[in-house]
């Protein structure tokens, strides 16, 4: 198990990228003058107190941000949110965090994000460029799940 | 408002069995953690163990393994701990508490009343 | 095992300054121990006072505070009120197990 959060970048399907918009993270299209967020990620240390089979547990941190995100209910409904958190006070806590920690699971080069809070709620993209990342039930409609991670060393 | 409530105090014979219940009320059971102390008469805390309700995943500390069982109903929000082989040192009020994240840290937010077990031939 | 100690015993006046202390036999104290803090009063429900060594619990009034002081966790209670009476009660991880202390029973006299 990593103790140092490993350096990632994240596209999805159609090649857009996350950007740090007004502290909201959007998904755009990579292009020159776009310059996409570097994620940090790195495996929850109570793997044995989490679902088996489900994923990797991780904490997704805006490398070099102090960011990191998270899933809250607004009204009945979860959310996706950027809270200005540690993402090594996150990994050292004696118990899982649950509201930061997603579920990681990888098919062939695909990766999605499943929340730990709120199984079944996954980190996805509007088909639409431009937009926020949100979390979605609607797997492989409307949203794009499914992201790509390439490490960065 | 939150709660935590308690079965009834219990009188064992030793070798038995007790159950002691802890209903939540006022919050998801599934969204935090349920933890069990115990305070033995004039003794301090002592920890029993943790279950995470949502999925059911226990913790216990090595000294309670085999002696303490943590389950939760999650339809009746209901914590519970059983304990085997009951013996006389096994006197002594049990505890639940919910262990919460909020902001920056855990903390013990909220106890039962705790449940005295009494072990007596 | 690791063995938590703290104060049996400790008297504060009211209005003045204590601060009770939390040892662990395995050596000193860190932030990795991620102590917490417990209140009981006479014929009340615990309360949680102090987690992650330092951070108050909601609702918590500012005279209470968490550190680490010489190798040891600290609670400091600073202008103790008389309803501030009561056992406290420290407890420190240790990987994936927590202990407790014995207790400190506060008089404010």
């Known amino acids: 198990k990593s103790e140092m959060p490993q350096p990632v970048s994240i596209q999805d399907i159609n090649h857009r990228v996350w950007v740090l918009q007004d502290q909201i993270l959007i998904a755009v299209p990579r292009k020159d003058r776009v310059s996409p967020v570097t994620i940090s990620l790195i495996s929850c240390r109570h793997v044995e107190t989490l679902e088996k089979d489900r994923g990797n547990p991780i904490y997704l941190g805006l490398n070099g941000l102090n960011l990191c995100l998270m899933c809250a209910k607004a009204g009945d409904q979860p959310t996706l949110q950027l809270k200005e958190k540690d993402i090594m006070d996150l990994y050292n806590q004696p118990e899982p965090v649950k509201s930061f920690l997603f579920y990681h699971s990888q098919s062939g080069r695909n990766s999605t994000f499943e929340s730990v809070a709120f199984p079944g709620w996954f980190i996805a993209v509007s088909s639409e460029g431009g937009c926020p990342l949100i979390l979605t039930q609607e797997l492989g409609k409307a949203n794009t799940t499914d992201f790509g991670l390439t490490m960065l060393f | 408002q939150v709660q935590l409530v308690q079965s009834g105090a219990e009188v064992k014979k030793p070798g038995a069995s007790v159950k002691v219940s802890c209903k939540a009320s006022?919050?998801?059971?599934?969204?935090?953690?349920i933890y069990w102390v115990r305070q033995a008469p004039g003794q301090g805390l002592e920890w029993i163990g943790r279950?995470?309700?949502?999925?059911?995943?226990?913790r216990y500390d090595p000294k309670f393994q085999g002696k303490a069982t943590l389950t939760t109903d999650t339809s009746t929000s209901t914590a519970y701990l059983e304990l085997s082989s009951l013996r006389s040192e096994d006197t002594a009020v049990y505890y639940c508490?919910?262990?919460?994240?909020?902001?920056?840290?855990?903390?013990?937010?909220?106890w039962g009343q705790g449940t005295l077990v009494t072990v007596s031939s | 095992q690791a063995v938590v100690t703290q104060e049996p015993s400790l008297t504060v006046s009211p209005g003045g300054t204590v601060t009770l202390t939390c040892r662990s036999s395995?050596?000193?104290?860190?932030?990795?121990?991620?102590a917490n803090w417990v209140q009981e009063k006479p014929g009340q429900l615990f309360t949680g006072l102090i987690g992650?060594?330092?951070d108050r619990a909601p609702g918590v009034p500012a005279r209470f505070s968490g550190s680490l002081l010489g190798g040891k966790a600290a609670l400091t209670l600073s202008g103790a009120q008389p309803e501030d009476e009561a056992d406290y009660f420290c407890?420190?991880?240790?990987?994936?197990?927590?202990?407790f202390g014995g207790g400190t029973k506060l008089t404010v006299l």
């Open positions: 395995t050596g000193a104290v860190t932030t990795s121990n991620y």
């Open positions: 006022g919050f998801n059971i599934k969204d935090t953690y």
């Open positions: 279950i995470d309700p949502a999925i059911g995943t226990t």
């Open positions: 992650g060594t330092n």
């Open positions: 508490a919910r262990y919460d994240y909020s902001g920056s840290s855990f903390y013990f937010d909220y």
């Open positions: 407890a420190l991880w240790y990987s994936n197990h927590l202990v």
